[in-house]
């Protein structure tokens, strides 16, 4: 790491190393021989999170609703905005700008995984023994029917889509 | 009272390394930058770098650069400086020293040190 | 970096005499600067004064310091026996610090 001129939160102006300002607040101007560092704080919906020497503040994010998004942590002078999804949908990346709709898992397909704010829904293929017969952001794999259980026995066998169906043992004479 | 108390004299081979310690005691580590600071035979003084012990950070001399490194165990209140790559130059006595409170400071560095530890001379020869 | 250069690089005064030491600074450094008294070589310094003319506490008053941009002084007052030593300005504007050469203060 290169040497600094400065200690740590200051910075170099004209040949003296001047106080940053703390998050929060923003530059009015630098210090002088005999004056310090004169800093803002921010003003409502605006946030700095660094120690800096910005002369303007950032703007809180916008949770935009039409793009689906509702605030999930509302901004301070020193921290900007979060943003999530509204109910069943999800970020389309980390910054979290836009959502879409939660996938959903196809017949034969359980959820591995439920979708989050951030994430969208894992599926995984129902295994052998499992089904699943409908398309669902929610449902897992169910196991199939257990006939002999119900004293009842396998009359068609079960696929990944569909369960087995049980039906009546034979009766010897 | 403050004392920073440097550990012993040190006899070092060219190419080789020396770690000096400096135990501070009296004040809160944390709060105080801690400088080194050396003195070769007859000669000034000739600032290596500093350690912030309260977040790691470190500042070296362009001189020392890529042969010193500055470190600090805060649950035992000391303070390190190992020099690498030993010369016969490097034969001096090193202090660390104390500067003023952190927060102190609004324009300049103001590195002023107002205690010092007691020295440590590293003599390095063949 | 900035260079500091002190003058003279030694003094021979006596006991009761007045002293000034000289450092110049090869860039402003506004009123920082600190001045060192070693007693003996391979001895920690102690910090007489900082910002340029303010005494450091415990320091007695014979010493005081003036001086802001890159011209400073050190002065003794009346040079007491104790005084005999090495004295060192050192600036604390920017990174690196830096010493100057140092005067020898000598018994005449």
């Known amino acids: 790491e290169p040497p600094t001129a400065c200690r740590e939160k200051q910075y170099l102006i004209n040949s003296q190393c001047c106080s940053l300002c703390q998050p929060g607040q923003k530059l009015v101007s630098d210090c002088t021989e005999f004056t310090e560092t004169e800093c803002l704080p921010c003003g409502e919906s605006e946030f700095l999170d660094t120690w800096n020497r910005e002369t303007h503040c950032h703007q809180h994010k916008y949770c935009d609703p039409n793009l689906g998004l509702r605030v999930q942590q509302k901004g301070t002078s020193e921290t900007d905005t979060i943003c999530t999804c509204e109910e069943g949908w999800h970020c389309t990346s980390e910054a979290c700008e836009s959502c879409v709709l939660h996938r959903s898992c196809s017949p034969g397909f359980g959820v591995k995984q439920i979708a989050t704010g951030v994430s969208d829904t894992i599926c995984e293929p129902c295994p052998v023994g499992f089904f699943s017969n409908v398309s669902s952001a929610f449902e897992k794999c169910h196991p199939w029917t257990s006939c002999e259980t119900k004293d009842l026995v396998v009359q068609q066998a079960g696929t990944n889509k569909t369960d087995v169906v049980c039906g009546p043992q034979d009766r010897l004479r | 009272q403050v004392q920073l108390v440097q550990s012993g004299a040190e006899v070092k081979k060219p190419g080789a390394s020396v770690k000096v310690s400096c135990k501070a005691s009296?004040?809160?580590?944390?709060?105080?930058?801690m400088h080194w600071v050396r003195q070769a035979p007859g000669q000034g003084l000739e600032w290596m770098g500093w350690?912030?012990?309260?977040?790691?950070?470190?500042n070296y001399a362009q001189k020392f650069q890529g042969r010193v490194t500055m470190t600090r165990d805060t649950s035992i209140s000391t303070a390190y400086m190992e020099l690498n790559r030993l010369r016969s130059d490097d034969t001096a006595v090193y202090y660390c020293?104390?500067?003023?409170?952190?927060?102190?400071?609004?324009?300049?560095?103001?590195?002023?040190?107002?205690?010092w530890g007691q020295g440590t001379l590293v003599t390095v020869s063949s | 970096d900035i260079q500091m250069t002190q003058s003279p690089s030694s003094v021979s005064a006596s006991v009761g005499d007045r002293v000034t030491i000289t450092c110049r600074a090869s860039?402003?450094?506004?009123?920082?600067l600190a001045w060192y008294q070693q007693k003996i070589p391979g001895k920690a310094p102690n910090l007489l004064i900082?910002?340029?003319?303010t005494l450091q506490s415990g320091v007695p008053s014979r010493f005081s310091g003036s001086g802001s941009g890159t011209d400073f002084t050190l002065t003794i007052s009346s040079l007491q026996p104790e005084d005999f030593a090495t004295y060192y300005c050192q600036q604390a504007n920017i990174f690196p610090l830096t010493f100057g050469g140092g005067t020898k203060v000598e018994i005449k």
């Open positions: 900082y910002t340029a003319s």
């Open positions: 009296g004040y809160t580590f944390t709060g105080y930058y």
């Open positions: 860039q402003g450094i506004y009123s920082w």
């Open positions: 020293a104390r500067d003023q409170p952190l927060g102190y400071c609004t324009n300049g560095v103001c590195s002023y040190f107002d205690y």
């Open positions: 350690i912030n012990p309260d977040s790691g950070g470190t």
